[in-house]
Interface confidence: low
């Protein structure tokens, strides 16, 4: 929304860099065949590239990524009783970011 | 994706708290009547509540917010020439978060 110019600080661009984001651990990451369980924790922190680049033809992208396995609890409900199991989910952390040209596919002639 | 349990650290819940997010400054925040301009910067950082709560009946919500006016550059293109103007956009920062019960509306009987 628009406001008074007087008290406004100059806006600073959100530069292209890694930031902490929240990643929801969906159940189908653990088991696609069965929906009768819960996952704990339901979400974790990951590092992801975000922000803006200097013109619209470039996009903030990860230039270096790292896979990080974490152990979660799979809580199966069997005959109304919880059974605790362990599972591993591999998260993707972005380590470095860069402003990369958006390659638009040329139309096939 | 699933991986080996051996090297996996226990997953830590992404707690309900403020995190830095990127907010895209859309042109209609500046001027709804005219599309023939650019905004600089195109995005800024804001503080927003995110993360998970302990059960599915509660949600991470802002308990305290602050409006923050920032000055942006509105670059109008007039006869193919850029004209630099200033405008103010008011951003919403979340200052504090809480896990709040999701009130599901009762079905009308």
């Amino acid at each position: 929304s628009l406001g008074s110019l007087a008290a406004a600080e100059p806006a600073v661009i959100a530069e292209c860099k890694t930031r902490t984001e929240v990643f929801q651990i969906s159940r189908n990451l653990i088991d696609r065949t069965n929906a009768n369980f819960l996952v704990w924790p339901p979400c974790v922190e990951v590092q992801r590239c975000s922000g803006c680049c200097n013109n619209r033809n470039v996009q903030c992208r990860a230039s270096q990524v790292q896979m990080r396995p974490v152990q979660v609890r799979k809580i199966e409900i069997v005959r109304k009783k919880p059974i605790f199991k362990k599972a591993t989910v591999t998260l993707e952390d972005h380590l470095a970011c860069k402003c990369e040209t958006i390659v638009t596919p040329r139309p096939v002639t | 994706s699933l991986g080996s349990l051996a090297a996996a650290e226990p997953a830590v819940i992404a707690e309900c708290k403020t995190r830095t997010e990127v907010f895209q400054i859309s042109r209609n925040l500046i001027d709804r009547t005219n599309a023939n301009f650019l905004v600089w910067p195109p995005c800024v950082e804001v503080q927003r509540c995110s993360g998970c709560c302990n059960n599915r009946n509660v949600q991470c919500r802002a308990s305290q917010v602050q409006m923050r006016p920032v000055q942006v550059r509105k670059i109008e293109i007039v006869r193919k020439k850029p004209i630099f103007k200033k405008a103010t956009v008011t951003l919403e920062d979340h200052l504090a978060c809480k896990c709040e019960t999701i009130v599901t509306p009762r079905p009308v009987t």
């Epitope: 100059p10 661009i13 292209c16 860099k17 922000g51 033809n57 402003c99 040209t101 | 630099f84």
Partner: antibody
Framework: EVQLVESGGGLVQPGGSLRLSCAAS????????MSWVRQAPGKGLEWVST????????SYADSVKGRFTISRDNSKNTLYLQMNSLRAEDTAVYSC?????????????WGQGTLVTVSS | DIQMTQSPSSLSASVGDRVTITCRAS??????LNWYQQKPGKAPKLLIY???SLQSGVPSRFSGSGSGTDFTLTISSLQPEDFATYYC?????????FGGGTKVEIK
């Protein structure tokens, strides 16, 4: 008044290293993207590298990628260029430039430059 | 990479002359073109940015035009202090590239 003063140039042998500095004053250094541009004796201008205001985004010319590193210390209002594995073709006057216009990839203000000579 | 081709590479002109320098990009750069003036032993000075916008403090005899791939710098009435080398530069995308320069000499 905007002032950019480069230092650290000199004579170095091929394969050697140098670190250039650019001391900035007269403007809010931490709010602006900064660049290095070089000019070989009697030749034209060549862009070398650019760094964002916070230092998180960097870009390099292909001719220096992997050998040169741009960095900044906003607390000291100083821009740096670490030059390794120097070659004869890197001989030039290196100038720092401030980017503060319609795009951060133009050069509003320039320093006078510092001469780097790579020779055995 | 985007190549910037300037022409002519040099020209001789007299005080009061109208001088035109052209710059061509190897692909469209919209209006992301800037012009600089450099005098011997001095740092370059920004004259025109975004193809046609006059930098603050630059005399109005300098003007720029063009978009896409073809651009022009015009000096409407050449003054003694205008004898210098002029460079175009694209700021559309990295790697940033300059034209080879146009040296304006006294006839």
């Amino acid at each position: 008044e905007v002032q950019l003063v480069e230092s650290g140039g000199g004579l170095v042998q091929p394969g050697g290293s140098l670190r250039l500095s650019c001391a900035a004053s007269g403007f809010t250094f931490s709010s602006y993207w900064m660049s290095w541009v070089r000019q070989a004796p009697g030749k034209g201008l060549e862009w070398v590298s650019t760094i964002s205001d916070g230092g998180g985004t960097t870009s390099y010319a292909d001719s220096v990628k992997g050998r040169f590193t741009i960095s900044r210390d906003n607390s000291k209002n100083t821009l740096y260029l670490q030059m390794n594995s120097l070659r004869a073709e890197d001989t030039a006057v290196y100038s720092c430039a401030e980017s503060g216009g319609a795009t951060d990839y133009l050069f509003d203000y320039w320093g006078q430059g510092t001469l780097v000579t790579v020779s055995s | 990479d985007i190549q910037m081709t300037q022409s002519p590479s040099s020209l001789s002109a007299s005080v009061g002359d109208r001088v035109t320098i052209t710059c061509r990009a190897s692909q469209s750069i919209s209006s992301y073109l800037n012009w600089y003036q450099q005098k011997p032993g001095k740092a370059p000075k920004l004259l025109i940015y975004a193809a046609s916008s006059l930098q603050s403090g630059v005399p109005s005899r300098f003007s720029g035009s063009g978009s896409g791939t073809d651009f022009t710098l015009t000096i409407s009435s050449l003054q003694p202090e205008d004898f210098a080398t002029y460079y175009c530069q694209q700021s559309y995308i990295t790697p940033l590239t300059f034209g080879g320069g146009t040296k304006v000499e006294i006839k």
